[in-house]
């Protein structure tokens, strides 16, 4: 014997208080496959929580976060805040990135300034909180007489200018 | 697969207490500090309390501290948050969540894995 209620297509319910008839979903609940007993309540997407897509008898609302926050969670089933620039997001809250690290992005963590001497590069433009330093190019990238490595002063004899 | 499911939440009144339970599955339990976090309707995550894999070294946010107790049982694979003194702000939604090593701090979200949550509704 086939279960009646294998007929009901989504969008509805199997009601057994009328004798197995499909009942469409009563407003603010959906049934997303065929053959259910009951329909689920919508989500309701409210506080930092706004409606991304709403909810129809076939499927349930979908929320993202308001300005100023970001999903995280399956489905986003948390709002987390966003930072500035130049901060991180800790447990107890926004704060600056420390000396020496970095965070060009809304959320993440501060990272540290690239260290342009391991590759034998210079400095070229310094780190802030909210940028990486910019390695200028190697000592022997350059071309004579262009070399940003200043070289060692000669030796002056009194009452000479420096050369 | 890695899961985290809480339970214990409920509609309870001001100065009252509730206990949350959070089972965990798919990983070594003992191996990684967990933490429990917590989202009110109108403001963003809020970090509540941390404990690191062995259950020695526990954090608390200051809006909790003296009123909020975590704790873990390694054995059964739970993580548990005993609150008590309860008030409206702390009605959220609560979740629990595995974090990426053993230790912690009250300092670095260090999260990998979110459970979907316990509603705790505060109110008269």
């Known amino acids: 014997l086939q279960d009646p209620c294998s007929n009901c297509p989504a969008g509805t319910f199997c009601d057994n208080n009328r004798n197995q008839i499909c009942s469409p979903c009563p407003p603010n609940s959906f049934s997303s496959a065929g053959g259910q007993r009951t329909c689920d309540i919508c989500r309701q997407c409210k506080g930092v929580f706004r409606t991304r897509k709403e909810c129809s008898s076939t499927s349930n609302a979908e929320c993202d976060c308001t300005p100023g926050f970001h999903c995280l969670g399956a489905g986003c089933s948390m709002c987390e805040q966003d930072c500035k620039q130049g901060q991180e997001l800790t447990k107890k809250g926004c704060k600056d990135c420390c000396f020496g690290t970095f965070n060009d992005q809304k959320r993440g963590i501060c990272r540290p300034w690239t260290n342009c001497s391991l590759d034998g590069k210079s400095v070229l433009v310094n780190g802030t909180k909210e940028r990486d330093v910019v390695c200028g190019p190697s000592p022997a990238d350059l071309s004579p007489g262009a070399s940003s490595v200043t070289p060692p002063a000669p030796a002056r004899e009194p009452g000479h200018s420096p050369q | 697969e890695v899961q985290l499911v809480e339970s214990g939440g409920g509609v309870v009144q001001p100065g009252g207490s509730l206990r949350l339970s959070c089972a965990a599955s798919?990983?070594?339990?003992?191996?990684?500090?967990m933490t429990w976090v917590r989202q009110a309707p109108e403001k963003g995550l809020e970090w509540v309390s941390s404990i690191s894999g062995s259950g020695v070294s526990t954090y608390y946010a200051d809006s909790v501290k003296g009123r909020f107790t975590i704790s873990r049982d390694n054995s059964k694979n739970t993580l548990y948050l005993q609150m008590t003194r309860l008030t409206a702000e702390d009605t959220a939604v609560y979740f629990c969540a595995k974090e990426g090593s053993s230790e912690t701090d009250d300092h670095y979200y260090n999260v990998d894995v979110w459970g979907q949550g316990t509603t705790v509704t505060v109110s008269s």
């Open positions: 798919g990983f070594t339990f003992s191996n990684y500090a």
